[in-house]
């Protein structure tokens, strides 16, 4: 979340997230000074997760269960500060943040999961989609990544044009100051928009033992 209530309980982590965290720690121990190529690292993690047995995954699933319990426990006693629900102003004419490869993938398979499991909660649908993505090989993810990259490129052009045109009047003051803080601002926007993407997925409502939709 980055900015927000520091007292707010940390979000719950999935079994795969725990696995990736462990991978990162192992990598740091083995190569303390090496910089990590994030996409390569993610690919390797994903491939390793795919070939792990249910028994090996069990340890991480237990960690996720414990973390979920911790999160639920902490959320029971958490009181959000007043006005936390207010979202900051977003210009409706601003170019829309491009979807990630995972988001595009979700759009493909969400109807199937929801259709076959109508009683499933938004969170459970999202969890299934996450599992499916994590069990998808890099080659199979390629078309989604290609399209996401294309959309990102288009967004970057559009946002540059949008910024050049100038934002609504209130935002036009202090151009020099704005330039200095542009990089920091973009980083913050990245964070915020990742959150937005998650929210959008939830708003959209968010395995079959087998696919059970055969008529």
């Amino acid at each position: 979340m980055g900015k927000g209530d520091p007292k707010k309980p940390r979000g719950k982590m999935s079994s795969y997230a725990f696995f990736v965290q462990t991978c990162r720690e192992e990598h740091k121990k083995k190569h303390p000074d090496a910089s990590v190529n994030f996409s390569e690292f993610s690919k390797k993690c994903s491939e390793r997760w795919k070939t792990m047995s249910a028994k090996e995954k069990g340890k991480f699933e237990d960690m996720a269960k414990a973390d979920k319990a911790r999160y639920e426990r902490e959320m029971k006693t958490y009181i959000p500060p007043k006005g936390e629900t207010k979202k900051k102003f977003k210009d409706p004419n601003a170019p829309k943040r491009p979807p990630s490869a995972f988001f595009l993938f979700c759009s493909e398979y969400r109807p199937k999961i929801k259709g076959e499991h109508p009683g499933l909660s938004i969170g459970d649908v999202a969890k299934k989609l996450g599992e499916m993505w994590n069990n998808t090989a890099a080659d199979d993810k390629q078309p989604y990544e290609k399209k996401a990259a294309k959309l990102k490129e288009k967004y970057e052009k559009d946002i540059a044009a949008y910024r050049a045109k100038g934002k609504p009047d209130a935002a036009k003051k202090g151009v020099v100051k704005a330039e200095k803080s542009k990089k920091k601002k973009e980083e913050e926007e990245d964070e915020e928009d990742e959150e937005d993407e998650e929210e959008e997925e939830d708003e959209e409502d968010e395995d079959e033992e087998e696919d059970d939709d055969d008529e």
């Epitope: 070939t51 249910a54 759009s107 090989a137 399209k147 079959e208 087998e210």
Partner: antibody, heavy 122, light 107 residues
């Protein structure tokens, strides 16, 4: 009953084109990945192409990349394979098949159509 | 691409025999392996998916095992209708690849 029925095969000259169709029934077509798999006479099975549920994403075997195009019409419950620049080595029975997933996200092909024969010869 | 190698290519056996067909992947594929049966002039039919799960409607004399790179399909007691060609296939990544097939013939 879940069924897949291919059509459109036939005799075509090298360099020619052909469009195969696969009519699906008995399941929610728009939920599934669909594939084409071929089998040359007396030979084994070779995966050809795959398309995602909405039709927005496609995958191809190197042997057909740039020549074949997979597509689908979910409103008609139909899968297609447009084959251009056909070669003698494309001669085969072409099967359409559905990609099914287990609870652990392992994909397998079920069911398969009866196949349609494509012969590329002068 | 992941290469799938089946052995033997052909096999002669008698009704009642126990038969094992093996499949080896050129790299580790976890349990992303399926087995199909194909009778002459017909389409393939799935027998086993995810290395060891029996497809519904398939007789229990068929079983699958293995993970990583080595897999086996076992028919515990051959029946006359089992004489056909068997293929293994990996669904670990794209392109999906098949073994070259094992033809099971009557001795």
């Amino acid at each position: 009953e879940v069924q897949l029925l291919e059509s459109g095969g036939g005799l075509v000259q090298p360099g020619g084109s052909l469009r195969l169709s696969c009519a699906a029934s008995g399941f929610t077509f728009s939920y599934y990945d669909m594939h084409w798999v071929r089998q040359a006479p007396g030979k084994g099975l070779e995966w050809v192409s795959r398309i995602s549920p909405s039709g927005g994403y496609t995958w191809y075997a190197d042997s057909v990349k740039g020549r074949f195009t997979i597509s689908r019409d979910n409103s008609k419950n139909t899968l297609y394979l447009q084959m251009n620049s056909l070669r003698a080595e494309d001669t085969a029975v072409y099967y359409c098949t559905r990609g099914r997933y287990t609870s652990g996200w392992h994909e397998y092909f079920d069911p398969w159509g009866q196949g349609t024969l494509v012969t590329v010869s002068s | 691409d992941i290469q799938m190698t089946q052995s033997p290519s052909s096999l002669s056996a008698s009704v009642g025999d126990r038969v094992t067909i093996t499949c080896r992947a050129s790299q580790s594929i976890g349990t992303y392996l399926n087995w199909y049966q194909q009778k002459p002039g017909t389409a393939p039919k799935v027998l086993i998916y995810a290395a060891s799960s029996l497809q519904s409607g398939v007789p229990s004399r068929f079983s699958g095992s293995g993970s990583g790179t080595d897999f086996t399909l076992t028919i515990s007691s051959l029946q006359p209708e089992d004489f056909s060609t068997y293929y293994c296939q990996q669904s670990y990544n794209t392109p999906r690849t098949f073994g070259q097939g094992t033809k099971l013939e009557i001795k």
